[in-house]
Amino acid sequence: APVPPGEDSKDVAAPHRQPLTSSERIDKQIRYILDGISALRKETCNKSNMCESSKEALAENNLNLPKMAEKDGCFQSGFNEETCLVKIITGLLEFEVYLEYLQNRFESSEEQARAVQMSTKVLIQFLQKKAKNLDAITTPDPTTNASLLTKLQAQNQWLQDMTTHLILRSFKEFLQSSLRALRQM
């Protein structure tokens, strides 16, 4: 797995570099997770033909994956910093159960899947420090998450491959939209 942000050789070689601001650290963390997703998607696409399936065909699924909508305040029209930040944190918390599901789905990229999961936990902590209105953030119910995980793991092989692909694609899109909005803050 790649070295977590802030621990690479470039950082060691430049001891006089200014410490990263909170926004820079969040930006770097999201890019690190996107790199991890990219590596996981490579393995998924090499293993199955899901990546060739059209978006429309894949949309016909019953997964309730977090997605950005106009009302969330993360797009240019209706942009609202606080509403958007709450949506990003809430969405990441909702993705955690799906990232847990990914843990046993990879052979050669097992460490990478773990790195994506752990880095997301760290990202949530960074973002919670940035948010003023933590009361507005709803945490998913552990019991509901546990039964969802059981249900996903009980699917047949084809559906599990489909689910893996959908989680990676949706998580990537969510992170991209989140980072674009965070860059406006």
Partner: nanobody
Framework: EVQLVESGGGLVQAGGSLQLSCTAS????????MAWFRQAPGQEREFVTD???????WYADSVKGRFTISRDNAKNTVYLQMDSLRPEDTAVYYC?????????????????WGQGTQVTVSS
């Protein structure tokens, strides 16, 4: 890293329209966020607009409602439709690409740049 070539610049009267194109080669174009920046003589290069991998767009306030960014992944091309042009839109327009598919309003977010195309709006 992707190579970018802009085209479509030229001289146009105030109130007129122009469409710029930027064609990419050497990368998976559909996975990049694409942006347009511009630089007027003696000024800093400034953000105009961008379009993310999933199609979300952002515009600078100065061009909102007049300029439209779009992409055609099959042709590896991003377009900038410029309407109701003003003399203050005169600048060299640069195309930029972000391999993370995100974009943003600052130059540091982009890892590939085109050479630029001149747009002159006369009054």
């Amino acid at each position: 890293e992707v190579q970018l070539v802009e085209s479509g610049g030229g001289l146009v009267q105030a109130g007129g329209s122009l469409q710029l194109s930027c064609t990419a080669s050497g990368g998976t174009f559909s996975e990049y966020a694409m942006a347009w920046f511009r630089q007027a003589p003696g000024q800093e290069r400034e953000f105009v607009t961008d379009i993310g991998e999933s199609g979300g767009t952002w515009y600078a306030d100065s061009v909102k409602g007049r300029f439209t960014i779009s992409r055609d992944n099959a042709k590896n091309t991003v377009y900038l439709q410029m309407d109701s042009l003003r003399p203050e839109d005169t600048a060299v327009y640069y195309c930029a690409a972000d391999s993370y598919g995100v974009g943003g309003g600052a130059e540091r977010y982009y890892d590939s740049w085109g050479q630029g195309t001149q747009v002159t709006v006369s009054s």
